[in-house]
Amino acid sequence: IWSAVFLNSLFNQEVQIPLTESYCGPCPKNWICYKNNCYQFFDESKNWYESQASCMSQNASLLKVYSKEDQDLLKLVKSYHWMGLVHIPTNGSWQWEDGSILSPNLLTIIEMQKGDCALYASSFKGYIENCSTPNTYICMQRTV
């Protein structure tokens, strides 16, 4: 059973979220479960390091984008939120908290100003930002 959930503060339009846990989960209480991932959007603004610590304290990590298909609800996310992508100055690459490298063609990331951390925005966009800038953030937990 699927329900059209309109989470006005999070998404630009209706997002299909499964109602029953048999399709997805388990997830922490009040988190969004979608295609075997648990997501939570946190409204308080923190810098990247504080956001990472907050997610870790809940046995989660900052958002990792790995699949446009499995994470299609992210297309519609409103505003800008810290995700778990960071710049590694030693080799110039961008990688996720788990050490994996950013896959090509998953995100269109623009560096409008110098920075080593990245914000997620709608339509699989990313914005590079100074890590010390306060922003809201998305935590994610894999269920499988």
Partner: antibody, heavy 123, light 107 residues
Framework: EVQLVQSGAEVKEPGESLKISCKNS????????VGWVRQMPGKGLEWMGI????????RYSPSFQGQVTISADKSINTAYLQWSSLKASDTAMYYC????????????????WGQGTLVTVSS | EIVLTQSPATLSLSPGERATLSCRAS??????LAWYQQKPGQAPRLLIY???NRATGIPARFSGSGSGTDFTLTISSLEPEDFAVYYC?????????FGQGTKVEIK
């Protein structure tokens, strides 16, 4: 081959509206950002703003915020720059360009440019 | 916004000579600076990005150096086609900005 082809020169009167275009080809239009730069007669270059054609997310330089509108139609790979009420001071050459991708990240330089559209505003 | 000041305004040199163009930023832009060449009636062309990287197809006689606030574009031996206006541009902070340009003219 990446190409950006701009619409032709325009001569307008003050107060008139105008929309100029920049047709992009030879690459995935929705994987890059496109921008506009102004060059007034005999002067240097000024960033106006940039747009992500995937969802029309737009960023304007403060000097141009509210003065122009940047838009894009991803179905025809075209970016636009428009004015609702032209002034004589809008007389300039306008260039569109594609932002560079370096190590998978879009960075703030134009690697490809349109040929320019000359806009003349005079009564 | 970050102001870029280029010097000199005009550089008069002969073919085969070395050209040294300067760009100074009002605050640090790290290495986030590019150089463009513009010939009369043409769009600019990206020469150097992020201070020292040559863009695709740019001859080796063009080189860039510097970081922080002081940058240099060097043309090791001027060819006839190099006489043009050169602009620097920073992308360290939005709005991105250009310098006012240096004209390299034939002496």
């Amino acid at each position: 081959e990446v190409q950006l082809v701009q619409s032709g020169a325009e001569v307008k009167e003050p107060g008139e509206s105008l929309k100029i275009s920049c047709k992009n080809s030879g690459y995935s239009f929705t994987n890059y950002w496109v921008g506009w730069v102004r060059q007034m007669p005999g002067k240097g270059l000024e960033w106006m703003g940039i747009i992500y054609p995937g969802d029309s997310d737009t960023r304007y330089s403060p000097s141009f915020q509210g003065q122009v509108t940047i838009s894009a139609d991803k179905s025809i790979n075209t970016a636009y720059l428009q004015w609702s009420s032209l002034k004589a001071s809008d007389t300039a050459m306008y260039y569109c360009g594609r932002l560079t991708m370096f190590r998978g990240i879009i960075i703030g330089y134009f690697d490809y440019w349109g040929q320019g559209t000359l806009v003349t505003v005079s009564s | 916004e970050i102001v870029l000041t280029q010097s000199p305004a005009t550089l008069s040199l002969s073919p085969g000579e070395r050209a040294t163009l300067s760009c100074r930023a009002s605050q640090s832009v790290s290495s986030y600076l590019a150089w463009y060449q513009q010939k009369p009636g043409q769009a600019p062309r990206l020469l150097i990005y992020d201070a020292s990287n040559r863009a695709t197809g740019i001859p080796a006689r063009f080189s860039g150096s510097g970081s922080g606030t002081d940058f240099t574009l060097t043309i090791s031996s001027l060819e006839p086609e190099d006489f043009a206006v050169y602009y620097c541009q920073q992308r360290s902070n939005w709005p991105w900005t250009f310098g006012q340009g240096t004209k390299v003219e034939i002496k």
